[in-house]
Interface confidence: low
């Protein structure tokens, strides 16, 4: 039975040209995390594998940095980066847990750095 829950940074906004940290945290389970996938819509951004370490997809290697922890740092943000991001935790023996983050990249300097809404 899957008892865990994913906590995320929720809905966040950032300025064009800036950076943002996407973070998820898996709690309430003793399952072993074997891998975390970071995806944007249907595109794979990065993977952190417990045994093999980090891999950044080639098309994102100039703008994506691993960490902190199992999180992901997006750099040189553009308006096109606006959208849904998913952290997919592969665990044993529970299976797969998925968290969702919505990022809005704003043109102006009114963007808040950090969570604007919190997803429970």
């Amino acid at each position: 039975m899957m008892t865990g829950t994913i906590e995320t940074t929720g809905n966040i906004s950032a300025e064009k040209g800036g950076s943002i940290i996407l973070q998820c945290h898996l709690s309430s389970t003793t399952a072993q995390v074997t891998q975390v996938n970071w995806e944007q819509q249907d595109q794979l951004l990065a993977i952190c594998n417990a045994d093999l370490g980090w891999h950044i997809s080639p098309s994102f290697k100039d703008r994506v940095a691993p960490g902190p922890g199992l999180g992901l740092t997006l750099q040189s943000l553009t308006v096109n980066d606006t959208g849904e991001y998913f952290c997919i935790y592969h665990t044993y023996p529970d299976g797969t847990y998925t968290g969702r983050i919505f990022l809005e990249v704003l043109e102006s300097s009114v963007a808040e750095h950090g969570a604007r809404f919190q997803i429970p």
Epitope: T34, Q35, L44, I47, L52, H55, S57, P58, H90
Partner: nanobody
């Protein structure tokens, strides 16, 4: 849905050999990397070995280098782990796994086998 079925485990004396097999029920080899992990009692699951879909690249944990050999037969959709000079510390449940293949790196484990027990004891 692809399933992985391991076989070949059992009881063997220290210094002995075993050959594990991992049969895939659907097309796996060629576009995927196949690998082996193991989990000893009371310990975390650890990487053992992997082989690229082409068979050109193999990877081994330091603890098994020179003793274990991974291979694959694309025509049979089967991966193998030849284990020689077995030690008591090799005792574990051995799991077969499948990766999606990325250029230069191997990730995204999406299918696990159920495991086969290897016991090394005199």
């Amino acid at each position: 849905e692809v399933q992985l079925v391991e076989s070949g485990g059992g009881l063997v004396q220290p210094g002995g050999s075993l050959r594990l097999s991992c049969a895939a029920s659907g097309p796996t080899l060629g576009s995927y990397v196949m690998g082996w992990f193991r989990q000893a009692p009371g310990k975390e699951r650890e990487f053992v070995a992997a082989i690229s879909g082409s068979g050109d690249d193999t990877y081994y944990a330091d603890s098994v280098k020179g003793r274990f050999t991974i291979s694959a037969d694309n025509s049979k959709n089967t991966a193998y782990l030849q284990m020689n000079s077995l030690k008591p510390e090799d005792t574990a449940v051995y799991y077969c796994a499948r990766w999606r293949e990325f250029p230069g790196y191997y990730f995204a484990i999406d299918v696990w086998g159920q495991g086969t027990l290897v016991t090394v004891s005199s």
